[in-house]
Amino acid sequence: EPHSLRYNLTVLSWDGSVQSGFLTEVHLDGQPFLRCDRQKCRAKPQGQWAEDVLGNKTWDRETRDLTGNGKDLRMTLAHIKDQKEGLHSLQEIRVCEIHEDNSTRSSQHFYYDGELFLSQNLETKEWTMPQSSRAQTLAMNVRNFLKEDAMKTKTHYHAMHADCLQELRRYLKSGVVLRRTVPPMVNVTRSEASEGNITVTCRASGFYPWNITLSWRQDGVSLSHDTQQWGDVLPDGNGTYQTWVATRICQGEEQRFTCYMEHSGNHSTHPVPSGKVLVLQSHWQ
């Protein structure tokens, strides 16, 4: 997986009037990292993970840059002619990546009311837009505004590409990004479903990175997809992730089922508790 830095800026308008606040969220390697609030823009680490890793570093530069980007996006929203009454949002997402072979990727995406209407590859300067007429109109609108100050556009977008990569490299160098592996805790619970049946749920939590395989096996053999229900892999607020998989089985058949987990090259299997034991905690095999 490449290292990545992702900026997500959102500005709002109400009845055609652009609001003064904005919201910026920064994700580092897919983890919530910094947040710049519309009330007061102070870049601050998100969650215990970021605070532990980042320590007491001051974020003045990040705060200044994020505030500046917020102002730019507000001006862009003001030039969108499609301002109907009510609440509207303009969102700009910028992503840069450094791959294992040191190659880089940078892109920028604009969303209006949550709908993508314009993207740019910040390395090739190539613009793309969806086919819908609304997206085309919005895209023309925004591109024309950005072209009004050709110099600003040229320097601004080159700088965005360079700055993003520079920041990412700086974070990598300072040890902020630890290519860490945190194994999951896995537990299996059972709950009564209907007469004679129980639902068994296998939960994995506290793992990093987010890629994980979690599935049920009967007599050691993988169950078909349609007999299992999966939860999304979600951040748990500690810089790690959680997910689950469930299936329905006949009561008394618990001993035939195991939950199989694979994460970062490590594997473990976890049995189902029988009878009245509600939770059976299992660690690595």
Epitope: R217, Q218, D219, G220, V221, G252, E254, Q255, R256, F257, T258, H267, T269, P271, V272, P273, S274, G275, V277, L280
Partner: antibody, heavy 118, light 107 residues
Framework: QIQLVQSGSELKKPGASVKVSCKAF????????MNWVKQAPGQGLKWMGW????????TYAQGFTGRFVFSLETSVSTAYLQISSLKAEDTAVYFC???????????WGQGTLVTVSS | DIQMTQSPSTLSASVGDRVTITCSAS??????LNWYQQKPGKAPKLLIQ???LLHSGVPSRFSGSGSGTEYTLTISSLQPDDFATYFC?????????FGGGTKVEIK
Amino acid sequence: QIQLVQSGSELKKPGASVKVSCKAFGYTFTNYGMNWVKQAPGQGLKWMGWINTYTGEPTYAQGFTGRFVFSLETSVSTAYLQISSLKAEDTAVYFCARNYGNYLFDYWGQGTLVTVSS
Amino acid sequence: DIQMTQSPSTLSASVGDRVTITCSASQGISNYLNWYQQKPGKAPKLLIQYTSLLHSGVPSRFSGSGSGTEYTLTISSLQPDDFATYFCQQYSKFPRTFGGGTKVEIK
């Protein structure tokens, strides 16, 4: 520490019966089934079947029906293998092995040698 | 029943040797294969499950691989403690069946 402790060696005459015990330590007995495996002298391993320690339901492999009975005494975390009408070909070491997920024999008893000889 | 055929039945090797034991199934078993080690007069011990997953406490010199009908157990550098008989076991279908065993003896 997980352990399965089996009863001692038995010398029986043809036609007699034998009951081998397997006592589990170190885990919740009713969370895992119990397998029985036969190893005749100088031979490989042959799976005899398993018993669900929660429901008490036995499953016998072909060739181990009729004279072979798996049973339980869950209050003392013990599984039993009973063989009746013993024959010379029943001479073997019998192992109990914890049935993990009904596919894996993850912990084994030390084995019980049953010798059938007149 | 699925027949499991192990080869060789006996293997003579020295400490430090790389040893490979093969297990062939009479039909595809989709990696549903375990390996056990047994020493004379002792119970078998689980080494590897699901073709390649080492059981807890098993040294990393043991590894498993394979697919379809052909599977191998490899000991990268044979140690004195490794002289024993090794069995494969399939769990793709009932009944569970074992290979005939491979005895690894001192050359």
